[in-house]
């Protein structure tokens, strides 16, 4: 049994950890694989992570940490039984996907604009809380060419636009994600999708 | 900076296929938030939309209704270009024919290539 | 498919003064509306999108307004390298169509 993809990890850098490998070949990775990890720290203590599979040869850890700071280090060990496959480490705070925001709703009752909100997946305490910030994806559902990407730079979790810059009578699906440049993290996974019908009505025209 | 640069022959018999080539630097033909469009110029028909290409997870075209039995636009996504095709040419298809890119916020065309006139004829 | 009517078909101004063109549209296409200018041999330059939005690195004496299918087109100072041909384009129906365009020129 040998590691063909050595494991790479990203953190949400609040309490989850995510680290995929793939073996050789297929591996019923709960059954023969353990990944213990341990915190280079005086008096830490090691902690075990049973992996998942991942596809055939693919598997997949969660590792459980307490709040992350910048300057934490963790070594890695991969084993399967008593043979030690793999050795490495793993910073945190250098490879940090955020988790994906939240509740994105569509106010579609202010006046002539629609108004996108989600809240912060991060507590306030969290050094990523007012460090975030969005690429809101909206797509018309009749269109598959109306596909369109806001950046939001601003830390408020809200977009606006105008109703009339899209497609009056017809439906619209948006999602949301985030990424910190603080810690030139990936973006996070896109947030569940929401759904509405853009109903713009035209203004009155006055000659 | 986005940069389109058309290339191919300024000449086509009519019955002909006329074939013209948009190569992209700055950009990729397989973005999911631009539209990479052909569009031709002439005094008699003013600016008009032939067809698009584009990729959302898959690839798509749309043509116009007037060429739509006679176009045909693929990308290449080896050489970060797009091409038109046009069978079966007459004289009313000469014109100055343009690539553009279409983008993100409802697909208006923001970059253009340089314009190449195709004249049909014998 | 949506057509684009512009007008007037030729517009004579003086440098320092405003030019106002208009563009009318079939039926509706909210604030799909983009303007462009074209000089002899060359491409279309996009000056307005979303009907009023500036594009990049275009003056502001340039302003775009209206919706539905009544537009607008504002030079609020004429300079001489303004003089040039203007059209407008809906952006809202496939396929995208461009307004017949306006001659703006010297008076």
């Known amino acids: 049994m040998k590691v063909l993809q050595e494991p790479t990890c990203v953190s949400d850098y609040m309490s989850i950890s995510t680290c995929e490998w793939k073996m050789n070949g297929p591996t019923n990775c709960s059954t023969e694989l353990r990944l213990l990890y341990q915190l280079v720290f005086l008096l830490s203590e090691a902690h075990t992570c049973i992996p998942e599979n991942n596809g055939g040869a693919g598997c997949v850890c969660h590792l459980l940490m307490d709040d992350v700071v910048s300057a934490d280090n963790y070594t890695l060990d991969l084993w399967a039984g008593q043979q030690l496959l793999w050795k490495g480490s793993f910073k945190p705070s250098e490879h940090v996907k955020p988790r994906a925001p939240g509740n994105l709703t569509v106010h579609t009752n202010v006046s002539d604009t629609l108004l996108l909100t989600w809240s912060n997946p991060y507590p306030p305490d969290n050094y990523l809380y007012n460090h975030l910030t969005y690429a809101v994806n909206i797509w018309s559902e009749n269109d598959p060419a109306d596909f369109r990407i806001y950046n939001v730079t601003y830390l408020e979790p809200s977009l606006r636009i105008a109703a009339s810059t899209l497609k009056s009578g017809i439906s619209y699906r948006a999602r949301v994600r985030a990424w910190a440049q603080c810690y030139n993290t990936t973006w996070s996974e896109w947030s569940p999708s929401t759904k509405w019908h853009n109903s713009y009505r035209e203004p009155f025209e006055q000659h | 900076q986005v940069q389109l640069q058309q290339s191919g022959p300024g000449l086509v018999k009519p019955s002909q296929t006329l074939s013209l080539t948009c190569a992209i630097s700055g950009d990729s033909v397989s973005s999911n938030i631009a539209t990479w469009n052909w569009i031709r110029q002439s005094p008699s028909r003013g600016l008009e939309c032939l067809g698009r290409?584009?990729?959302?997870?898959?690839?798509?075209?749309d043509y116009a209704v007037s060429v739509k039995s006679r176009i045909t636009i693929n990308p290449d996504t080896s050489k970060n270009q797009f091409s038109l095709q046009l069978n079966s040419v007459t004289p009313e298809d000469t014109a100055v024919y343009y690539c553009?890119?279409?983008?993100?916020?409802?697909?208006?065309?923001?970059?253009w290539g340089q314009g190449t006139l195709v004249t049909v004829s014998s | 498919e949506i057509v684009m009517t512009q007008s007037p078909a030729t517009l004579s101004v003086s440098p320092g003064e405003r030019a106002t063109l208009s563009c009318r549209a079939s039926q509706s296409v909210s604030s799909n509306l983009a303007w462009y200018q074209q000089k002899p041999g060359q491409a279309p330059r996009l000056l307005i999108y979303g009907a009023s939005t500036r594009a990049t690195g275009i003056p502001t004496r340039f302003s775009g307004s209206g919706s539905g299918t009544e537009f607008t087109l504002t030079i609020s100072s004429l300079q001489s390298e303004d003089f040039a041909v203007y059209y407008c384009q809906q952006y809202n129906n496939w396929p995208y169509t461009f307004g017949q365009g306006t001659k703006l020129e010297i008076k």
């Open positions: 290409t584009y990729y959302r997870s898959k690839w798509y075209s």
């Open positions: 553009a890119r279409g983008w993100n916020y409802g697909y208006y065309f923001d970059y």
